[in-house]
């Protein structure tokens, strides 16, 4: 067990802070919830603290919760490939470019680290080149989320990882909006981190609303499990 992994043996409180600017539309989002890495489970509620969110909530899911991949469940035989927990408590910087097909792009930079006993994800997001009447600024996405695989590989030069995946957002007319994600994670501290073999995270997310909440918001339940590396031969013959 890495030193960082010991911080995730129980339920951990999570705070998320996002400041965004998409085509000049500025907004802030505040998130609170809990993570339980034993089950790869996240429960979070996000509130737009500046009024109405100028983009659809589903376009921010990867920035919020795929941001705290340290809560992913890594099976016992894969624990030596868990970069995310090994970087804690000092944390990691997570940078992404997200290309929305036939539309604009988001660039995000986040610092994910422990502050006291709380895991904090602080994010800056800049979006450019979006069509005002497109699927994103035109709010044409359905309020739901598909399952995805998130592919991880080591980046030895930067002592971190590179991550690629493609999100499929459902559009109200029955078609799909693709969002290509290019991600890089580097540790904040200078302690040792685990550099993984290639593998993937399998994610399942459910979006809902709080019937008592008047503010623009999103409630998220998510399960994430690492996969893609088989047991060694010695395991098979036990």
């Amino acid at each position: 067990m890495s030193k960082g992994e010991e911080l995730f043996t129980g339920v951990v409180p999570i705070l998320v802070e996002l400041d965004g600017d998409v085509n000049g539309h500025k907004f802030s989002v505040s998130g609170e919830g809990e993570g339980d890495a034993t089950y790869g489970k996240l429960t979070l509620k996000f509130i737009c603290t500046t009024g109405k969110l100028p983009v659809p909530w589903p376009t921010l899911v990867t920035t919020f919760s795929y941001g705290v991949q340290c809560f992913s469940r890594y099976p016992d035989h894969m624990k030596q490939h868990d970069f995310f927990k090994s970087a804690m408590p000092e944390g990691y910087v997570q940078e992404r470019t997200i290309f929305f097909k036939d539309d604009g792009n988001y660039k995000t930079r986040a610092e994910v680290k422990f502050e006291g006993d709380t895991l904090v994800n602080r994010i800056e997001l800049k979006g450019i080149d979006f069509k005002e009447d497109g699927n994103i600024l035109g709010h044409k996405l359905e309020y739901n989320y598909n399952s995805h695989n998130v592919y991880i590989m080591a980046d030895k030069q930067k002592n971190g990882i590179k991550v690629n995946f493609k999100i499929r957002h459902n559009i109200e007319d029955g078609s799909v909006q693709l969002a290509d994600h290019y991600q890089q994670n580097t540790p904040i501290g200078d302690g040792p981190v685990l550099l993984p073999d290639n593998h993937y995270l399998s994610t399942q997310s459910a979006l809902s609303k709080d019937p008592n909440e008047k503010r623009d918001h999103m409630v998220l339940l998510e399960f994430v499990t690492a996969a893609g590396i088989t047991h060694g031969m010695d395991e098979l013959y036990k």
Epitope: P13, L15, S30, E32, T43, T49, T118
Partner: nanobody, 121 residues
């Protein structure tokens, strides 16, 4: 996600006492700062009192200091508001609130209950 349900409201005469309860579910209660807000007819919702995660720190609005007491029982996932020497101006809907952040007197908690009516005649 955290859900809050208030109880204990009602109609009382001036000078009487009431105890409100706020039962929390769906989260780890001991993680959250808890508090009470109130909204009188035709007025904005206002801060009444808050209590820290451990129960060690409290903050009160000047209008209720010395009369209201907040407490919590982390084993029962419940927060309480003991209201003594009630006045007609305490009449309002009382809302329980919770949040990981320390929202203080000015901030906005993340989670709210539906409220319970307190009427002082």
């Amino acid at each position: 996600q955290v859900q809050l349900v208030e109880s204990g409201g009602g109609l009382v005469q001036a000078g009487a006492a009431l105890r409100l309860s706020c039962a929390a579910s769906g989260g780890t209660f001991s993680f959250y700062n808890m508090g009470w807000f109130r909204q009188a007819p035709g007025k904005e919702r206002e801060f009444v009192v808050s209590i820290s995660r451990s129960g060690g720190g409290t903050a009160y609005a000047d209008s209720v200091k010395g009369r209201f007491t907040i407490s919590r029982d982390n084993a029962k996932n419940t927060a309480y508001l003991q209201m003594n020497s009630l006045k007609p101006e305490d009449t309002a809907v009382y809302y329980c609130a919770a949040g990981l952040r320390d929202w203080g007197r000015e901030g906005e908690p993340h989670y709210w209950g539906q409220g319970t009516q307190v009427t002082v005649s």
